[in-house]
């Protein structure tokens, strides 16, 4: 058993069954020796009396909140919360695989630029009786800060019969360096707590291979005199770090129709123009990645061709 | 070319080669992003490895207001990988596939620490750690870890030199 | 399987013109950008221009302008390439070759003799 | 117009051997470059596009690396069937254009 937070403890369980359970020990917190009596959530029938109380907690039903009183009056409380571990697995009920970029990914996470602030998202079926804390680090054995903010409820989606839910969190590193080379990851830990079922969640990385720059702004086109060809040009992203001549991008340029399947004309450049080839009904579409280090490309940015 | 008086370096002809050395790094590795490689205790192989750090001057201002700590720790930094690379590490069993971008790679990390460093001239160079690791699968891990760390070496490298290039050419 | 086939070999005098089909099989014509590439003997490849069957559009190397034509026909599934003014230095095997994407050429058709001889 | 320029203009390699082909491009054009492989009497087959994205169907020991202004198409371990002129094309900019090729011949 341990401590989550001030009054709130986490049993860990081997969850199989007939599993013997953990022998827990709770302690009124109170200078009174006598007369005290304790009760689990909202019922009234006193599990027993003295300044500890002694339970065996083996399944849900012996989780909760755990009530010491003294002539009617509450002394203080103990949450109790269970972590499962099955066939030593840590539960992973609460959040739903992402499945990307590998199995077992439960959080997400993307930075727009090198400026040490990102974002994590994660994905859940459950909508209410539901909190999550999120902590972070550069490094573990000799952490360095990172701030995050309070998770929140960012979209909701239908998928067939069940609503998704998907929170996200900010984080910013206290004392980021944009131009260094990273060399220990960032730490993110979830604690995800829904009704009286405790799971955590962790992913580590750099923040160089979680980059995702933002679509380029301000396409523009400008046919060319006698030819099918039309200059298109672009601007970096407002987001993306300063200056361009260190943090540069490179991007891809394509022309194509509304369907996947149909004829396109495409090219790669470090510039932030390119000339090719409209064609009616289809659009052109500039993406940008990391000159200098394959992290993800940006969202596309389009334009009409007309 | 980057002296011991302090001169410049050849910025555009060290832009060039480090921007092929990322090219390279990432042909040599391309699906390195796929492979969690912190999983598998990745503090004491790539620990001893030169990362350009924080106070190394190899961000904009840092370069502007002299350019030769970094360039230096860019030296330190190319030699150590190309030791490594020329070592048993890379040249040991498993055998590299043939088409395997590892001897290129090689040839340009040599090229552009020549390039930074003139004959007659030395700086200082980093003692290579002894990781000879006894079991091929620890062999070919430990390529991946030094492949991936090479991977984000050059790219704070190419920066430097696109920077350069861009702004401190005569 | 998508192939393009080529009519046969021709022989002209100088100053004349040539015109050469390429007919489309295993895919909608419209579908691909259709480009012509010539070889002259022993020596290597020469891009001439594109055409986008879905809507006429041209494009020709600087080189070609005003020279070549390129055309299709979508009710037979055939590209056409007319070379006028030939000169001896024409003397090429000419290749029409496509792709869904304009900058490279994914198939390729079997090639055309043209000898310019006077 | 840009300036493609391959080397060696040939290549004499012993079957099972690693062949390595260049093209240079006389301006920096990103990785738009392509590979094909023509065969005496035969139309050019293409084996990479984008400077190294192989394409399915040919064999994997064909390989392609480079960006701006120089690339390489590696041969891993020739075989009988790989005897052929190799040329670069570059779709940076129109006029699309070819390099002179490189022709891997027996040693």
């Known amino acids: 058993i341990w401590e989550l937070k001030k009054d709130v403890y986490v049993v860990e369980l081997d969850w199989y069954p007939d599993a013997p359970g953990e022998m827990v020990v709770l302690t009124c917190d109170t200078p009174e020796e006598d007369g005290i009596t304790w009760t689990l959530d909202q019922s009234s029938e006193v599990l027993g009396s003295g300044k500890t109380l002694t339970i065996q907690v083996k399944e849900f039903g012996d989780a909760g909140q755990y009530t010491c009183h003294k002539g009617g009056e509450v002394l203080s409380h103990s949450l109790l919360l269970l972590h499962k571990k099955e066939d030593g697995i840590w539960s992973t009920d609460i959040l739903k695989d992402q499945k990307e970029p590998k199995n077992k990914t439960f959080l997400r996470c993307e930075a727009k630029n090198y400026s040490g602030r990102f974002t994590c998202w994660w994905l859940t079926t459950i909508s209410t009786d539901l909190t999550f804390s999120v902590k972070s680090s550069r490094g573990s054995s000799d952490p360095q800060g990172v701030t995050c903010g309070a998770a929140t409820l960012s979209a909701e989606r239908v998928r067939g019969d069940n609503k998704e839910y998907e929170y996200s969190v900010e984080c910013q590193e206290d004392s980021a360096c944009p131009a260094a080379e990273e060399s220990l990851p960032i730490e993110v830990m979830v604690d995800a707590v829904h009704k009286l079922k405790y799971e955590n969640y962790t992913s580590s990385f750099f923040i160089r291979d979680i980059i995702k720059p933002d679509p380029p702004k301000n396409l523009q086109l400008k046919p060319l005199k006698n030819s099918r060809q039309v200059e298109v040009s672009w601007e970096y992203p407002d987001t993306w770090s300063t200056p361009h001549s260190y943090f540069s991008l490179t991007f891809c340029v394509q022309v194509q129709g509304k369907s996947k399947r149909e004829k396109k004309d495409r090219v790669f450049t470090d510039k932030t123009s390119a000339t090719v080839i409209c064609r009616k009904n289809a659009s052109i579409s500039v993406r940008a990645q990391d000159r200098y280090y394959s992290s993800s490309w940006s969202e596309w940015a389009s334009v009409p061709c007309s | 070319r980057a002296v011991p008086g302090g001169s410049s370096p050849a910025w555009t002809q060290c832009q060039q080669l480090s921007q092929k050395l990322c090219t390279l790094a990432w042909s040599a590795h391309p699906l390195v992003g796929h492979m969690d490689l912190r999983e598998e205790g990745d503090e004491e192989t790539t620990n001893d490895v030169p990362h350009i750090q924080c106070g190394d001057g190899c961000d904009p201002q840092g370069l502007r207001d002299n350019s030769q700590f970094c360039l230096q720790r860019i030296h330190q930094g190319l030699i150590f990988y190309e030791k490594l690379l020329g070592s048993d590490i890379f040249t040991g069993e498993p055998s590299l596939l043939p088409d395997s971008p590892v001897g290129q790679l090689h040839a340009s990390l040599l090229g552009l620490s020549q390039l930074l460093q003139p004959e007659g001239h030395h700086w200082e160079t980093q003692q290579i750690p002894s990781l000879s690791p006894s079991q091929p699968w620890q062999r070919l891990l430990l390529r991946f870890k030094i492949l991936r760390s090479l991977q984000a070496f050059v790219a704070v490298a190419a920066r430097v030199f696109a920077h350069g290039a861009a702004t401190l050419s005569p | 399987q998508v192939q393009l086939v080529q009519s046969g070999a021709e022989v002209k005098k100088p100053g004349a013109s040539v015109k050469v089909s390429c007919k489309a099989s295993?895919?909608?014509?419209?579908?691909?950008?259709l480009h012509w590439v010539r070889q002259a003997p022993g020596q290597g490849l020469e891009w001439m221009g594109w055409?986008?069957?879905?809507?006429?559009?041209?494009e020709s190397a600087p080189k070609f302008q005003g020279r070549v034509t390129m055309t299709t026909d979508t009710s037979t599934s055939t590209a056409y390439m007319e070379l006028r003014s030939l000169r001896s230095d024409d003397t090429a095997v000419y290749y029409c070759?496509?792709?869904?994407?304009?900058?490279?050429?994914?198939?390729w058709g079997q090639g055309t003799m043209v000898t310019v001889s006077s | 117009e840009i300036v493609m320029t391959q080397s060696p203009a040939t290549l004499s390699v012993s079957p099972g051997e690693r062949a390595t082909l260049s093209c240079r491009a006389s301006q920096s054009i990103s990785i738009n470059l392509h590979w094909y492989q023509q065969k005496p009497g035969q139309a050019p087959r293409l084996l990479i596009y984008?400077?190294?994205q192989s394409i399915s169907g040919i064999p994997a020991r064909f390989s392609g690396s480079g960006s701006g202004t120089e690339f390489t198409l590696t041969i891993s371990s020739l075989q009988s069937e790989d005897f052929a002129v190799y040329y670069c094309q570059q779709s940076n900019s129109f006029p699309l254009t070819f390099g002179g090729g490189t022709k891997v011949e027996i040693k």
């Open positions: 070759a496509a792709n869904k994407e304009l900058r490279y050429f994914d198939v």
């Open positions: 984008f400077a190294s």
């Open positions: 295993g895919y909608t014509l419209t579908d691909y950008y």
């Open positions: 055409i986008d069957p879905e809507n006429g559009d041209t």
